[in-house]
């Protein structure tokens, strides 16, 4: 795991501690909170980023209708348990022994229970719908220009191959970005859609995770695209298991 060689920092994760103690005196970076080594050429997993965040000091195209099984992250921040690869453990518990099951993006997918709760496997989130509303502009953006710009952004900034950007829908002022990725589709080095969506979400909120890079400056044919609202829906390969009580 190496980082930028000249100044020992991690370009893709500012929530790291870096030092030239890798093999041959090379720069090595470790995530805050977990102390896990991270690969600074790619995105850090959302689990490690959430853990680092909790440890840091506090400061005519029709739009897609999310399915009834779509999850929204209403629980907010928590200090997650990550596996040795930096992925979310299927079962998460808080300090008061309240436990719940999460999907691969760390969003709760069951009712909360006690320590006896079993989460047999980490269920993969294979479809993410990013719903954006942009600020008023002189005219609507050209849809194909918007599509191309967002694909370029996800490849260059988040390293997500365009094959995983399934569609970009646009009905002014709403933009929807659909990310799709089955477990079998991921090849060596491919970024996870959950990690890309999290970096994008933080960029949109003006909380960039990148080191020393400017904030997100999104332009479509020179026209700034300023987002005023974001909603992210997560669809899992297996539907979530909530009791009827939650739905009323």
């Amino acid at each position: 795991h190496t980082a930028a060689q000249d100044n020992c920092t991690c370009p893709t994760n500012k929530m790291t501690v870096c030092s030239p103690d890798g093999p041959g005196g090379r720069c090595q970076c470790r995530a805050l909170g977990s102390g896990m080594a991270v690969d600074c050429s790619t995105l850090t997993s959302k689990c490690l980023l959430l853990k680092a965040r909790m440890s840091a000091p506090k400061n005519a195209r029709t739009l897609v209708r999310p399915s009834e099984h779509a999850l929204v992250d209403n629980d907010g921040l928590y200090d997650p348990d990550c596996d040795p690869e930096g992925r979310f453990k299927a079962r998460q518990c808080n300090q008061t022994s309240v436990c719940w099951c999460v999907n691969s993006v760390g969003v709760r997918r069951t009712d909360k229970g006690d320590l006896s709760l079993r989460c047999d496997e980490l269920v993969r989130t294979h479809h993410i719908l990013i719903d954006l509303r942009h600020r008023p502009t002189a005219g609507a953006f050209n849809h194909s220009d918007l599509d191309a710009e967002l694909r370029r952004l996800f490849r260059e900034r988040y390293r997500l191959h365009p094959k995983f950007v399934a569609a970009v829908h646009y009905e002014q002022p709403t933009i929807q970005i659909e990310l799709r990725q089955n477990t079998s589709q991921k090849a060596a080095g491919d970024v996870d859609i959950g990690d890309a969506a999290y970096y994008f979400e933080r960029d949109i909120k003006g909380e960039s995770l990148f080191q020393g890079r400017g904030g997100l400056d999104l332009r479509v044919r020179g026209e700034p695209l300023q987002v005023e609202r974001t909603l992210i829906y997560y669809l899992d390969e297996i539907p979530p298991k909530f009791s009827m009580k939650r739905l009323t």
Epitope: P11, E156, S184, V191
Partner: antibody, heavy 119, light 108 residues
Framework: QVQLVQSGAEVKKPGASVKVSCKAS????????MHWVRQAPGQGLEWMGE????????SYAQKFKGRVTITRDTSTSTAYMELSSLRSEDTAVYYC????????????WGQGTLVTVSS | DIQMTQSPSSLSASVGDRVTITCRAS??????LNWYQQKPGKAPKLLIY???RLQSGVPSRFSGSGSGTDFTLTISSLQPEDFATYFC??????????FGQGTKLEIK
Amino acid sequence: QVQLVQSGAEVKKPGASVKVSCKASGYTFTSYWMHWVRQAPGQGLEWMGEITPSDNYTSYAQKFKGRVTITRDTSTSTAYMELSSLRSEDTAVYYCARGHGNYVSFDYWGQGTLVTVSS
Amino acid sequence: DIQMTQSPSSLSASVGDRVTITCRASQDISNYLNWYQQKPGKAPKLLIYYTSRLQSGVPSRFSGSGSGTDFTLTISSLQPEDFATYFCQQGYTLPPYTFGQGTKLEIK
């Protein structure tokens, strides 16, 4: 060890098609991108296209769109590159190469297949 | 498409020399720059990926540096087997992934 073994040299007439094969071994075929790169005699390297064997996704360089088709057979761990409407300037050595999704570096290459287009 | 320009296009050097080859991208490519070595009649061989990471099995006399648009491949002490053609390649943006035109390293 990782190996990519390509089919033998081909001589084709202008307007014909050629299909080059690339058999992978020593790794899980569906876990890596496969790319095709060509090199005209005495010239540089030119990227043609890519495929993910797991789901048959392909993308091609604009220059070759409509003429090139990359396919795969997961049962034999083999990738194929077919180039149609051949012309003399397609005379080149064609390489398959295993790729990494993030760096887009090509860490293992086939030995190359010389395709000669001549009337 | 991103253009990659190598310099020089050819150079002569002696065994033991320190040699530097440069590669310039037509736009910022961060650190997504790879270097290959090719010998006559053979397939290219990956030397360095992500600007400075040495591919497994490649001798430590090869090193890479740079960021953004300007990159360098350095061979600290030339060995007889290093005389070959070297190519840079970017993997930053959407396809196509582009190569430099090559630098031929010859024996002086």
